[in-house]
């Protein structure tokens, strides 16, 4: 089901945002332009009419680390990512729409410029719908292409 998100969502108070790293990419693609906050990402998505890709991850998670490497090294992924507003988060937001089936990491959620969470764009694991592993990189690429087909085109 598609869910419309509020652009005024606040950061989770219990997991407040850490100090900004030297680069907002956090290793997911140093040549790409990354937004700093969820609010900024929603605003840019709406105003630029580009879909938003949100990567939830943790520095000390082996699966986040592994996915990050293949994501950053895959030329097709990196090229396609240029067509998105990009955000990677190492903390949870209070917007429950970004964790439809739990706060596991890594997970990747797409948001349409209409501010609708693309809950229909899922990975291959029934118990963690938005999880991707290094072996799923082709599926992630396909899902990025799906997300680029916007729900409604702005005039």
């Amino acid at each position: 089901k598609d869910i419309t998100v509020k652009s005024g969502a606040k950061k989770d108070t219990k997991d407040s945002a850490p100090k900004l790293p030297q680069t907002l990419s956090r290793g997911w693609g140093d040549q790409l332009i990354w937004t700093q906050t969820y609010e900024e990402a929603l605003y840019k998505s709406k105003t630029s009419n580009k879909p938003l890709m949100i990567i939830h991850h943790l520095d000390e998670c082996p699966h986040s680390q592994a996915l990050k490497k293949v994501f950053a090294e895959n030329k097709e992924i990196q090229k396609l990512a240029e067509q998105f507003v990009l955000l990677n988060l190492v903390y949870e937001t209070t917007d429950k729409h970004l964790s439809p089936d739990g706060q596991y990491v890594p997970r990747i959620i797409f948001v349409d410029p209409s501010l609708t969470v693309r809950a229909d764009i899922t990975g291959r694991y029934s118990n963690r719908l938005y999880a991707y592993e290094p072996s799923d990189i082709a599926l992630l690429l396909d899902n990025m292409k799906k997300a680029l087909k916007l729900l409604k085109t702005e005039l």
Epitope: G27, A66, V70, N127
Partner: antibody, heavy 120, light 107 residues
């Protein structure tokens, strides 16, 4: 064919240092995680840490973090385990083990191991 | 750290018999569990990864199942060459941890 070959083991006195090597061949070295695992005589297996040769990112078991350091040399397709301030309890066979071919964390191939004995 | 408890510690089995080894994790590890076989004076060999995926070249008599906290390695019709110690490993969280091992002996 994937091959991992450890070397550098031997007898060392307590407080001493040793550098183990793991020479690899048969796959794209920079794109698979490399783990080090040890096995004390007659005991089970203990994970030491891993390194991503592509950029040198590492993670360690907290038990050895202050004394052991992982590194990689892309030109030589080799990874290294530098062990300092060695103790008797570090006596073990040390294995390198490659992660999944696709960059996944699971351990797919193991070297034959090299024995490190810490004794005075 | 995540603790993996393997059982039994030791199993003496006749050829062609079915062998079942269990591995219980102290917390949910999703399906991030591997199984290894180690023969005396040899390095471990990977049999199963992601709980149930068989590594290329491993005989089909080996199979893995489970998710969450409870996992099983099954050897469907034991052969003499399967005499070894079997270990489970969780790679869901740092530090990766191994079970204590199960020694399988041929009667």
């Amino acid at each position: 064919q994937v091959q991992l070959l450890e070397s550098g083991g031997g007898l060392v006195k307590p407080g001493g240092s040793l550098r183990l090597s793991c020479a690899t061949s048969g796959y794209v070295f920079s794109r698979s995680w490399m783990n080090w695992i040890r096995q004390a005589p007659g005991q089970g297996l203990e994970w030491i840490g891993w390194i991503y040769p592509g950029d040198g990112d590492t993670n360690y078991n907290g038990k050895v973090k202050d004394r052991f350091t992982l590194s990689a040399d892309k030109a030589k397709n080799s990874v290294y385990l530098q062990m300092n301030s060695l103790r008797a309890e570090d006596t073990a066979v040390y294995f390198c083990a490659r992660g999944g071919y696709d960059g996944s964390p699971w351990l797919s191939y193991w070297g034959q191991g090299t024995l490190v004995t810490v004794s005075s | 750290e995540i603790v993996l408890t393997q059982s039994p510690d030791f199993q003496s089995v006749t050829p062609k018999e079915k062998v079942t080894i269990t591995c219980k994790a102290s917390q949910d590890i999703n399906s991030y569990l591997s199984w290894f076989q180690q023969k005396p004076d040899q390095s471990p060999k990977t049999l199963i990864y992601r709980a149930n995926r068989l590594v290329d070249g491993v005989p089909s008599r080996f199979s893995g199942s489970g998710s969450g906290q409870d996992f099983t390695l099954t050897i469907n019709s034991l052969e003499a060459e399967d005499a070894a110690t079997y270990y489970c490993l969780q790679y869901d969280e740092f530090p990766f941890t191994f079970g204590g091992g199960t020694k399988v002996e041929i009667k």
